[in-house]
Interface confidence: medium
């Protein structure tokens, strides 16, 4: 969904799948004004590594193609718009 | 010019514990993983652990958890390792070395220049 | 665990000879890294993710291979270039290789 709406203090999961065999897989956050700013990054499966702001999240890669972030507790702070990325 | 600067050499009995240090300068402390690698005569070097100094955030290789904690100040940019229940095993030269990305991957671009422990009775 | 097997332990070579050092992994890496350690120093990075050279390095280095076997290449030894050599991969948690120690004769 393009749209998530969730209460402050819920755990929530982002999901992000690639078809395409990249190995590096990123999470980053938009804000106006902030630009992209990166989250979380993986290089390979269970290889997660801390981008630029990384607090308050957590990630998950069991899978090449998977890339999950986790909000493990919602705050009115994580409100963005989060994209995902992929590449070689 | 980035450096990381470690403590002096050690000798401890035994049973005792060690804690070794590594002063970062010339980059944001914070915002690298530091890691802390054993290097044994004719034994190869031995990935121990790493900090994120940012959050306190620690990997330990299962071979030293338990036995190796690390800490690290963010206000003076110094890396800890502490080893308790020393023993003869533990004698070898110990060094810090940052996490720099290349195409996204973690290398250890920087190192300290070492610590050497003797463990002895 | 990934296990890297470095040979020959030991490489005695000739001033301006070419050689090659290898590494091979017990299960597929995506990359690999090299580090020298000349005696009574910390190691330096020498080449990353396989086969880029590191800040510094001179071009005599370079580096190649895929999946469980990789290589590094000295293409005119010189003096300086006698030290100890690792390789070093990270998948799940870092491991090195047992090393090569480069003599020149």
């Known amino acids: 969904s393009r749209y998530l709406v969730k209460r402050t203090g819920e755990k929530v999961f982002l999901e992000c799948v690639q078809d395409m065999d990249h190995e590096n897989m990123f999470w980053y956050r938009q804000d106006p004004g902030l630009g992209l700013r990166l989250i979380y990054f993986s290089y390979d499966v269970k290889m997660k590594e801390k981008g630029d702001i990384p607090e308050g999240y957590s990630v998950s890669r069991e899978k090449k193609e998977r890339f999950s972030l986790i909000l493990e507790s919602a705050s009115t702070n994580q409100t963005s718009m989060y994209l995902c990325a992929s590449s070689l | 010019q980035i450096q990381l600067q470690q403590s002096g050499p050690e000798v401890v009995k035994p049973g005792a514990s060690v804690q070794i240090s590594c002063k970062a300068s010339g980059y944001t402390f914070s915002g690298s993983w530091m890691n802390w690698v054993k290097q044994r005569p004719g034994k190869g070097l031995e990935w121990i652990g790493r900090?994120?100094?940012?959050?306190?955030?620690?990997d330990y290789s299962g071979k030293f958890k338990g036995r190796a904690t690390l800490t690290a100040d963010k206000s003076s940019s110094t890396a800890y390792m502490r080893l308790s229940s020393l023993t003869s095993e533990d004698s070898a030269v110990y060094f810090c070395a940052r996490s720099g990305y290349f195409n996204y991957v973690p290398v250890f671009d920087y190192w300290g220049q070492g610590t050497t422990l003797s463990v002895s009775s | 665990q990934i296990v890297l097997t470095q040979s020959p332990a030991i490489m005695s070579a000739s001033l301006g000879e070419e050689i090659a050092l290898t590494c091979s992994a017990n299960s597929t890496v995506g990359y690999i890294h090299w580090y020298q350690q000349k005696s009574g120093t910390s190691p330096k990075l020498l080449i990353y993710t396989t086969s880029n050279l590191a800040s510094g390095v001179p071009s005599r280095f370079s580096g190649s291979g895929s999946g469980t076997f990789y290589s590094l290449t000295i293409s005119s030894v010189e003096a300086e270039d006698a030290a100890d050599y690792f390789c070093?991969?990270?998948?799940?948690?870092?491991?090195f290789g047992g090393g090569t120690k480069l003599e020149i004769k």
């Open positions: 070093h991969q990270w998948s799940f948690y870092p491991t």
């Open positions: 900090i994120y100094p940012g959050d306190g955030d620690t």
